[in-house]
Structures are given as C-alpha cells and as structure tokens.
C-alpha cells in the first residue's frame, strides 16, 4: 500500500459554533457551515455550527426561510462567521419579539 | 436507512474473471467512500479496496493490487469490483461497507452489506 | 503495515458473566479503533467506534476503552445473543483487522 495518506471523503471545513450544542466549542467540523435564525418563545434565537455529515444538512440547508425559522448553510472554511441568518419580513421585527444570540 | 446490496457473487475458474456491484440506498451515495471488504468462510476479515466519494481516487490492499478494479457510478448509486486473473485464495464472502466520512483520510465502516459469495475453484 | 493482534482467539463465557476482549496495534493509532461483532451467517455489525464511543442502538453492557497501541472490549454481562466473533480493526493509517475473539458458552 502507498505511504501517503489517501483521499476518500469530500473536504471537511472548520466553521464558527455558537449555540447550545456547542458546549465549550468555539469551532466545528463537518461538510457544511451554518448560521440560523428562529424565534423561540418570542425571542429571536442565532446559533452557528456545522453539520458533520451531508445528510443532516441536506433537508435543512435546501428548506426556504420561513417566519419562524431561517438557515443560511456554506461550504469552505469559517464560511459561517459573517453570515447571519434573515427571516423573510427582512428590515420588520415581529411584535413582541427581541434578539438573543444563544451562548 | 442506509442499506447494502452485493451481486454478482459465483463459481469461477482460475484466472478468469468476474465483476461485483453493491447497489446502495438510504443515504448521499456520491458523499462517502466506499469499501469492499472480504472474509474466507471461517476466517478472519480483510480489507480489499477503497474508493473515494468522487472515484478520482482508488486504493487496493497489497494482496490484490494489479489485478482488481474498484469503481463506482454515482448516477446510480451503485459500487463495483472487477477482479481479474482469480485465484484460488481469492475465494471469499465480499462485503461492500460504507465509509463513515468524518476524515478525509477514511474512517471507520459504519454499514455493510450481507455480502456476495466468489468461488474460485477449477 | 499495522498489524492488529487479538487476544484470546477463544474465550468461553458463561451467560451473565464479563468478558474482557483485548486488541493490540503494533504502533500507535491513537483512538481510531472499532469493534465489530459477527455472528454465523451475517455481515459484521459496528459495535464501538473512537475506542469507546457506543454505536447507535449498541446495548450499555458494551463497553470499549484504551488508546495508543492497547485497547479492551469489556461485555459485563453476556447475553445469549451476545456469542460471536469479535473483531476490532484500526483505521488511523489505511485499515487492517484483528484475528478475531470468538466468544462461546462455556
């Protein structure tokens, strides 16, 4: 067998993480980069992350913003760190609603 | 559900030839390396070959380098094994098995296939 | 090539007991180890991946450890469905499998 490493998957990219399911993380690891956007119990809710494998992105990177919930998803490195997720009434804010970014 | 399926598999003579396909399902086919792996009935397990997601690349286990081809056709989703020049210790159960796809590099199998029986025997 | 050495090849068990699998590599290959079980006419089925992560639906009475070159799967209480060949293979540089730990009814 050769020596060198081989090449069998598609590139991971590193992506900016923030939300819950982060933990202590600050970054993570997959196929896709995300940033979303949803509104949780009147407050507007921004996490950042990755999906590791193309399956876990597949439904939610192609499913349009709706005005709950909004997902932008990328492929390179950090390509989530200045994205920021938009709900379709873009420049309206909901009545009742403020914005929360999820640590 | 991610499944499996080898053909292909039967009774050869040495030195002939003979081709196995794993059709796949139940995940992004065109994502994920692919490997085949074979078993002697009673024995232990041997890795043969991988492919990468995009079959630009292709690597063999010493034992069957020059003689096998690993290949795949994305558009249907299907994984292949051309073996040439047979013998009889290739006689196996081949696995195709599904690469994890959390390294580059390759990783663990997370699924496999029932397996296809060759026999190489005069 | 690493070479993955199982040991016992057989172990006999009885049902409701532990049993202590161990697999060496002949050079470091951090915690990128699997351990699969295999029963008679049946492909091998993903039990532990990372060294000791579980794989989904792998009962709790599964349980893999070690790093670096040595590494252990502990069942700590056979179940009847639980006899078979156990195989671990390294994935750290290229792949290669162990022998084999067939777990039988003592």
């Known amino acids: 067998m050769e020596d060198e490493k081989p090449k069998v998957n598609p590139k991971l990219y590193m992506c900016v993480c923030e939300g819950l399911s982060c933990g202590n993380e600050d970054h993570c690891e997959g196929q896709q980069c995300f940033s979303s956007l949803s509104i949780n119990d009147g407050f507007h809710v921004y996490q950042k992350g990755c999906f590791q494998v193309y399956e876990q992105g597949k439904m939610t990177c192609k499913t349009p913003p709706s005005p709950g919930q909004a997902v932008e998803c990328c492929q390179g490195d950090w390509c989530n760190r200045n994205i920021t997720a938009q709900l379709p009434t873009k420049g309206k804010s909901f009545p009742g609603t403020q914005n929360f970014h999820l640590e | 559900q991610v499944h499996l399926v080898e053909s292909g598999g039967g009774v050869v003579q040495p030195g002939r030839s003979l081709r196995l396909s794993c059709a796949a399902s139940?995940?992004?086919?065109?994502?994920?390396?692919i490997h085949w792996v074979r078993q002697v009935p009673g024995k232990g397990l041997e890795w043969v070959a991988v492919i990468s997601y995009d079959g630009n690349n292709k690597y063999y286990g010493d034992s069957v380098k020059g003689r096998f081809t690993i290949s795949r056709d994305n558009s249907k989703n299907t994984l292949y094994l051309q073996m040439n020049s047979l013998r009889p210790e290739d006689t196996a159960i081949y696995y195709c098995?599904?690469?994890?796809?959390?390294?580059?590099?390759?990783?663990?199998?997370?699924?496999w296939g029932q397996g296809t029986l060759v026999t190489v025997s005069s | 090539e690493i070479v993955m050495t199982q040991s016992p090849a057989t172990l006999s068990v009885s049902t409701g007991e532990r049993a202590t699998l161990s697999c060496r590599a002949s050079q470091n290959i951090s915690s990128k180890l699997a351990w699969y079980q295999q029963k008679p006419g049946q492909a091998p089925r993903l039990l532990i991946y990372g060294a000791s992560t579980r794989a989904s639906g792998i009962p709790a009475r599964f349980w893999g450890s070690g790093s670096g070159t040595e590494f252990t799967l502990t069942i700590s209480s056979l179940q009847s469905e639980d006899f078979a060949v156990f195989y671990c293979?390294?994935?750290?540089?290229?792949?290669?499998f162990g022998q084999g730990t067939k777990v039988e009814i003592k």
């Open positions: 098995a599904k690469d994890r796809g959390l390294d580059t590099a390759g990783d663990y199998f997370d699924y």
């Open positions: 139940g995940f992004t086919f065109s994502n994920y390396g």
């Open positions: 293979l390294q994935y750290n540089n290229w792949w290669t």
